[in-house]
């Protein structure tokens, strides 16, 4: 009789579909992730099962707390879609699909500098390129550890470019660039490139 009542309750939407979620949607290959399957009904003993497409990945029982499934995303096909099944006795409901987005991390960018030197000014062109990493890649240029450009989004594999004009400085200046994509908390920096002061003829990047 209890099973019958549960099934009738499900049919009247008193037993809604479970919710499947993860703290991160964007992952890189090899990353460990936790998936949470939860239900609004906190009083029933619920059996949660996780599926990727039609493959059963695991089952947990829970009451009031979400079921936590720990996985490792190692291959592209493991991005999803995932589904969670909530079952009470012989009755079950499925969550909506959840898929991860697999993103390749950016590699350390390379910074190139070209300078056109005039008597009073330096016209500086900075180029920054990370040769690997999922697009878009956001590049930011720094001078002496201070950002001098907005984030420049690149949707192709060509370098980001930033131009600036400076009065001939009396001191050395250090430039570097940062590359980051949608992977959270994952940014890489180029090696610093030092521009010498204008004393003497030492300007290795200069086009006279």
């Amino acid at each position: 009789r209890k099973a019958v009542l549960d099934c009738e309750a499900m049919k009247t939407n008193e037993f809604p579909s479970p919710c499947l979620d993860s703290k991160t949607k964007v992952v890189m290959k090899g990353q460990n992730v936790s998936m949470f399957c939860s239900h609004k009904n906190k009083s029933l003993q619920i059996t949660y099962s996780l599926f990727r497409r039609k493959t059963h990945l695991g089952t947990q029982d829970g009451k009031g707390e979400p079921a936590i499934f720990n996985l490792s995303i190692t291959e592209a096909h493991e991005s999803g879609p995932y589904k969670c099944k909530a079952q009470v006795t012989s009755c079950s409901k499925y969550s909506r699909d959840f898929s991860f987005t697999i993103v390749d991390p950016v590699t350390s960018p390379v910074l190139n500098i070209m300078v056109i030197q005039t008597e009073t000014d330096r016209h500086i062109t900075l180029h920054c390129l990370s040769v690997n990493g999922s697009l878009p890649i956001n590049y930011t240029f720094f001078e002496n550890h201070v950002a001098i450009s907005p984030a420049i989004s690149k949707y192709d594999r060509e370098p980001a470019e930033f131009n600036l004009t400076k009065k001939n400085p009396g001191e050395e200046e250090e430039y570097r660039c940062e590359a980051k994509n949608r992977l959270p908390n994952y940014a890489t920096y180029s090696h610093p490139v030092t521009m010498p002061s204008t004393g003497g003829d030492s300007c290795p990047f200069c086009l006279k």
Partner: antibody, heavy 119, light 110 residues
Framework: EVQLVESGGGLVQPGGSLRLSCAAS????????MNWVRQAPGKGLEWIGM???????FYANWAKGRFTISRDNSKNTVYLQMNSLRAEDTAVYYC?????????????WGQGTLVTVSS | DIQMTQSPSSLSASVGDRVTITCQAS??????LAWYQQKPGKAPKLLIY???TLASGVPSRFSGSGSGTDFTLTISSLQPEDFATYYC????????????FGTGTKVTVL
């Protein structure tokens, strides 16, 4: 399973307009670049343009001005608006999703929709 | 802009033959090149990406090589289902684009 389904093709008179749709399922278009590619009868593949996550669009030189790509996130659908159509625009139009959020290989294609421009 | 030139434009071969198609970019595109197969009335199918990585489900008789400006698609032993048109595509630059795709190579039965 990721699927792309184009619709909106058909017969249109020279100078007319047409809007093609590409409905995506199994993929979040805010993370991937969606492209439009066409193929005239007996000819090769021709890239038209793409729309990326932030709604930014890129076009082939020849497509700028007459072709506009847009997106409706709530419907997970991308559109191709074609204006001032000419006979040489007669082609099968495909939408194709890249493996990345920018320029990339196109790993999933729709079935194509035929556009015929004729009086 | 980057132009992609394929050669030959067509070739005839027999089942079991080794077939090689080349694609040349007008400037360096590193290894950002893809190859597609297309059969009449069908959408193109991705074969190879990043110049040499086989797409999921593609038979190992297909292989790709090259970097910079010169690339090659090789079919080690042609099968009946391989008679089709093949296209290369640059995935490097969005600057001043006329077309991403090469001109195509049609492989027909000898």
């Amino acid at each position: 399973e990721v699927q792309l389904v184009e619709s909106g093709g058909g017969l249109v008179q020279p100078g007319g307009s047409l809007r093609l749709s590409c409905a995506a399922s199994g993929i979040d278009l805010s993370y991937y670049a969606m492209n439009w590619v066409r193929q005239a009868p007996g000819k090769g593949l021709e890239w038209i343009g793409m729309i990326v996550g932030g709604g930014i669009t890129f076009y082939a030189n020849w497509a700028k001005g007459r072709f506009t790509i847009s997106r409706d996130n709530s419907k997970n659908t991308v559109y191709l608006q074609m204006n001032s159509l000419r006979a040489e625009d007669t082609a099968v139009y495909y939408c194709a999703v890249g493996s990345d959020g920018g320029i990339s290989d196109f790993n999933i294609w729709g079935q194509g929709t035929l556009v015929t421009v004729s009086s | 802009d980057i132009q992609m030139t394929q050669s030959p434009s067509s070739l005839s071969a027999s089942v079991g033959d080794r077939v090689t198609i080349t694609c040349q970019a007008s400037q360096s595109i590193s290894s950002y090149l893809a190859w597609y197969q297309q059969k009449p009335g069908k959408a193109p199918k991705l074969l190879i990406y990043r110049a040499s990585t086989l797409a999921s489900g593609v038979p190992s008789r297909f292989s790709g090589s090259g970097s910079g400006t010169d690339f090659t698609l090789t079919i080690s032993s042609l099968q009946p289902e391989d008679f089709a048109t093949y296209y290369c595509q640059q995935a490097y630059s969005l600057s001043n684009v006329d077309n991403f795709f090469g001109t195509g190579t049609k492989v027909t039965v000898l």
